[in-house]
């Protein structure tokens, strides 16, 4: 505690500081989110959804933060994914994203309000000041698992996937050793918050990574343990191979195209 | 409406050669993957070659590797596939098709009526 | 490669329901598609993705696919519906089943 205490004192964490205008890109991304990209919530007040951040994190020790510290944020942002649209994902970011960028009705965390506001950013205050720090944030591994980035992404991930319902997709990347990371956030906390009595099935999709590899790697020893807990949980799961991810690619440039519409 | 036409069949010898036309319409021809499927008389379907939209990925099943090549012009809208040293077994109707299924999977979705080629001496 | 096996022959009354398998190691880990060849003519796309019915194919048709076994279902066959029928998968290279002929009797 009195190590916390110094730090934050000369505010030296081993993380990168606050990203450059935090406070106004939140808002920008705010007013494009409500405005254009869903007007369906167009209703959200960005000024309250900017002080309801802001309220989570300043003045308050930067390795302390609660999940408690975001309700207000998320009651704000709270929005409806349809059923059989939410896409989790791990470690394939960049595919789960150019995915929905062409599947529009489909949302991964990322595509919801909160996750659009976050995404890519890191942010930080400083205990008793008002001040924003933009030197240095607490580090995961280095100071604390308690910081105001890693709760956010804790508190907005267990409620995403606390909400989804029907069949639930999570994308996963097959050229890692450990297919699904226990450790990882779909691993440790939405595989737990699924709803069992809203969500039927969990569809992993094993995304390979180029033409010519045959192999089912829905078959890895990480998947199976991933069924094991899925079905444990009452939820039906089931496991499918994806050979082309270099079709992502090609739709990407091209979503126009129909052959980049598909039904999932 | 979608079209694929497939021309070029006929009578060869084994050993010979031929080249299949695909002639392609009512779709953006350069931006779908293509392949070739063909049927031997009384019998089921195997694929048989495939090229990327833009034709820089080329795929072959073991069967004619080294013997077949495919290819394509996108300014044409044809689909083409160059047959050598052909053997008996080639004999089948080859039909051109259209790969579809965005991302996730992948079918053919339009074909062509075929063509036959018939390899004897 | 996967290998996917189909009985040769499935026989149905006018009205009854078809069900044609298409078997394979762990099938459910791949998407499956289904066409249906007339004699003479082009194969045409009844089922992708599964399950999914491209437009214009009738509601009778439809597909399920988990564990060893895909499975294409025509509900009220009727005697159009007399055909052969390839299933196909994909890993890494395009694999078809064998095909079956239905037969519609009567």
């Known amino acids: 505690v009195s190590r916390w205490h110094q730090q934050s004192q000369r505010s030296q964490w081993g993380g990168r500081g606050t990203t450059d205008r935090f406070p106004e890109i939140i808002l920008e991304r705010c007013v494009e989110y409500t405005q254009t990209l869903l007007p369906e919530m167009r209703h959200v007040d960005c000024q309250n959804i900017w002080d309801a951040f802001k309220g989570a994190f300043i003045s308050k020790h930067p390795c302390k933060i609660t999940e408690e510290d975001y309700q207000p944020l998320l009651k704000l942002g709270n929005q409806t994914v349809p059923c059989n649209k939410t896409l989790l994902w791990s470690r394939t970011k960049h595919l789960a994203h150019q995915y929905t960028e062409i599947q529009r009705d489909v949302f991964t965390l990322e595509d919801t309000l909160l996750g659009y506001l976050a995404d890519d950013l890191t942010w930080c205050g400083e205990f008793e000041t008002s001040e924003i720090n933009y030197r240095s944030c607490p580090d995961w591994r280095k100071d604390c698992s308690s910081n105001p980035v890693s709760v956010f992404w804790k508190t907005v991930s267990r409620r995403f996937a606390e909400s989804a319902c029907g069949v639930v997709h999570v994308m996963l990347n097959g050229s890692c050793s450990n297919i699904f990371d226990k450790k990882s956030t779909f691993g440790s906390v939405e595989v737990h918050n699924l709803q069992p009595e809203k969500v039927h099935t969990l569809e992993a999709w094993v995304m390979h990574d180029g033409r010519g590899d045959s192999r089912d790697l829905c078959q890895d020893p990480s998947i199976k343990e991933l069924e094991l807990i899925i079905s444990k949980r009452n939820i039906t799961f089931s496991c499918k191979n994806i050979y082309r991810p270099d079709k992502f690619l090609q739709c990407a440039k091209t979503p126009e195209d129909s052959s980049c519409i598909s039904k999932i | 409406q979608v079209q694929l036409v497939e021309s070029g069949g006929g009578l060869v010898q084994p050993g010979g050669s031929l080249r299949l036309s695909c002639a392609a319409s009512?779709?953006?021809?350069?931006?779908?993957?293509m392949n070739w499927v063909r049927q031997a008389p009384g019998k089921g379907l195997e694929w048989v070659s495939g090229?990327?939209?833009?034709?820089?990925?080329?795929y072959y099943a073991d069967s004619v590797k080294g013997r077949f090549t495919i290819s394509r012009d996108n300014s044409k809208n044809t689909l083409y596939l160059q047959m050598n040293s052909l053997r008996a077994e080639d004999t089948a109707v080859y039909y051109c098709?259209?790969?579809?299924?965005?991302?996730?999977?992948?079918?053919?979705?339009?074909w062509g009526q075929g063509t036959l080629v018939t390899v004897s001496s | 490669d996967i290998e996917l096996t189909q009985p040769p022959s499935v026989s149905v009354a006018p009205g009854q329901t078809a069900r044609i398998s298409c078997s394979g190691d762990?099938?459910?880990?791949?998407?499956v598609s289904w066409y249906q060849q007339k004699p003479g003519q082009a194969p045409v796309l009844v089922i992708y993705?599964?399950?999914n019915r491209p437009s214009g194919i009738p509601e009778r048709f439809s597909g399920s696919n988990s564990g060893n076994t895909a499975t294409l279902t025509i509900s009220g066959t009727q005697a159009e519906d007399e055909a052969d029928y390839y299933c196909?998968?994909?890993?890494?290279?395009?694999?078809f089943g064998g095909g079956t002929k239905l037969t519609v009797l009567g």
């Open positions: 098709a259209r790969e579809d299924g965005s991302y996730m999977t992948d079918y053919f979705a339009y």
């Open positions: 009512g779709f953006t021809f350069s931006s779908y993957a």
């Open positions: 090229i990327s939209s833009w034709g820089s990925s080329t």
């Open positions: 762990n099938i459910g880990h791949y998407y």
């Open positions: 993705s599964d399950s």
């Open positions: 196909q998968s994909y890993n890494g290279t395009y694999v």
